[in-house]
């Protein structure tokens, strides 16, 4: 780790990277950008995948939380030799495939896609890219785009979730390092704490969920607090208020002492969830305490 800000959110992070001919002399900058960013996502529950695209898409590293596999994936990424066209949709297809398989497992982990490209997408290629990005969104993904050099910001705003999900890098590839902090800040959705972390068995409570990025949802009305009780039943609650650094949520009534509720947040009405290691436990409260 190289210090500085980090992200503690537990979600699935997909890097979709342009390796077309136009980035041939800039691959090192793309690699170092990904490497720096990858090291800032430090939750043990965070999984990562590296996908590259040119005339075809390739999954260089499938989704994994194994830090050794991620290290090896980064090594492979460094060895990539760019060449070919900018078929961005091929990259999104590879991400959608993985999200689809993960969703079939039952529990749906939130997916964040960071797609990087350096060129304008011509006609059909833009149509296909937007369509595939929409498919990824339909499967529950949040899509960010990084545009370097000759990109078309209007196109990227339609491929990404919104204009606010686009990171323009107008000063060329060497300027990629300069946006790491802002990408981290915008793409990181994390749950850091719950107040109170202990509640009285059988009583109704409100919980303040502290964290970051809760207003990064495409639609804040779709944000949910989720409580996974004793690793089995999941209860979703609509928050009373949604701010970027906290949620105010009704807590479920947990009848027995010693019950544990793991805190999760959904940004898309329960389609998928950001996990955390934050736990709310119940205790016995005598009257007046």
């Amino acid at each position: 780790e190289d210090g500085g800000p980090a992200c503690y959110g537990g979600f699935d992070l997909y890097f979709i990277l342009d390796k077309s001919g136009s980035v041939l002399h800039h691959w090192n900058e793309i690699y170092y950008f990904v490497e720096q960013l990858a090291h800032k996502f430090i939750s043990p529950q965070l999984r990562m995948s590296f996908i590259v695209f040119s005339t075809r898409g390739t999954t260089l590293m499938k989704l994994t939380e194994d830090r050794e596999q991620i290290r090896q994936g980064l090594e492979e990424l460094q060895k990539v030799l760019p060449g070919g066209d900018t078929y961005m949709h091929e990259g999104f297809e590879r991400a959608s495939e993985q999200i689809y398989y993960e969703n079939r497992q039952g529990y749906r982990t939130a997916s964040v896609i960071i797609a990087l490209t350096d060129g304008e997408l011509h006609e059909d290629l833009f149509f296909y890219s937007e369509r595939e990005a929409n498919r990824s969104r339909d499967l529950g993904a949040i899509v960010y785009c990084v545009g370097v050099k000759d990109f078309n910001e209007t196109q990227l705003a339609r491929i990404a979730d919104s204009k606010d999900h686009v990171f323009p890098v107008n000063d060329g590839f060497q300027a990629l390092q300069g946006i790491i902090h802002s990408i981290l800040k915008k793409s990181c959705i994390e749950i850091l704490a719950a107040e109170p972390s202990t509640i009285c068995a059988g009583e109704s409570f409100q919980v303040v969920v502290r964290g970051n990025g809760f207003r990064h949802a495409r639609n804040v009305d779709r944000v949910l607090c989720s409580f996974k009780i004793n690793d089995s039943v999941t209860l979703n609650e609509k928050p009373f208020s949604v701010e970027d650094t906290y949620l105010l949520c009704p807590a479920p009534i947990l009848k027995e002492v010693g019950m544990k509720a793991a805190l999760q947040v959904s940004m898309n009405d329960g389609l998928s969830f950001i996990s955390s290691s934050v736990i709310i436990t119940t205790t016995h409260c005598s009257d007046g305490s």
């Epitope: 075809r56 999954t59 260089l60 499938k62 959608s96 495939e97 689809y100 398989y101 339909d138 499967l139």
Partner: antibody, heavy 118, light 108 residues
Framework: QVQLKESGPALVKPTQTLTLTCTFS??????????VSWIRQPPGKALEWLAH???????YYSTSLKTRLTISKDTSKNQVVLTMTNMDPVDTATYYC??????????WGQGTLVTVSS | DIELTQPPSVSVAPGQTARISCSGD??????VHWYQQKPGQAPVLVIY???KRPSGIPERFSGSNSGNTATLTISGTQAEDEADYYC???????????FGGGTKLTVL
Amino acid sequence: QVQLKESGPALVKPTQTLTLTCTFSGFSLSTSGMGVSWIRQPPGKALEWLAHINLDDDKYYSTSLKTRLTISKDTSKNQVVLTMTNMDPVDTATYYCARGGYGDMDVWGQGTLVTVSS
Amino acid sequence: DIELTQPPSVSVAPGQTARISCSGDNIRSMFVHWYQQKPGQAPVLVIYADNKRPSGIPERFSGSNSGNTATLTISGTQAEDEADYYCSSYDYNAHLVVFGGGTKLTVL
């Protein structure tokens, strides 16, 4: 409960066109990533994928049979139809339809045996 | 189009571990699925996306994928596991599904 059932003629003559219908229930083609594939298996031989159709009406075909196949769907009837032109005795096989997304087919129909003979 | 190659047959003693391979160029960058087919029956998906088990499939079935080979492993093989096994994958470049030639598993 997800179910698929193939229907069509048991016997077709050489050069004729085969039309097979897959009627499904328990799922919707409106789910992102979801689709229906057709697969066939000649007696005693391996499985061979034929065609796939998905929510967005994208159609994909086996390279070797592309010119003879047409796949279509009627979402309101929960049906997917496969037509295969210019049938030949080597096309004698059990034809299956299956639900799948990206190449994984998690639920299959029971299959229908089609014999091509004059 | 990609090609997936399987051994025609594999034999295993009851209770032992059976391994069925499926090889293809750079297969590890693709997702491999495995189907079990018993005589006169439709195929059944036993492993999808390299190593995921659909509900209802026994834990003795597992999958892996690295290098140029994907492997279906059946630990503690039972007589009822005797069947044909097919691997398959999605060829994105041609937008089609490819099956291996199948492996007949015999439980001795």
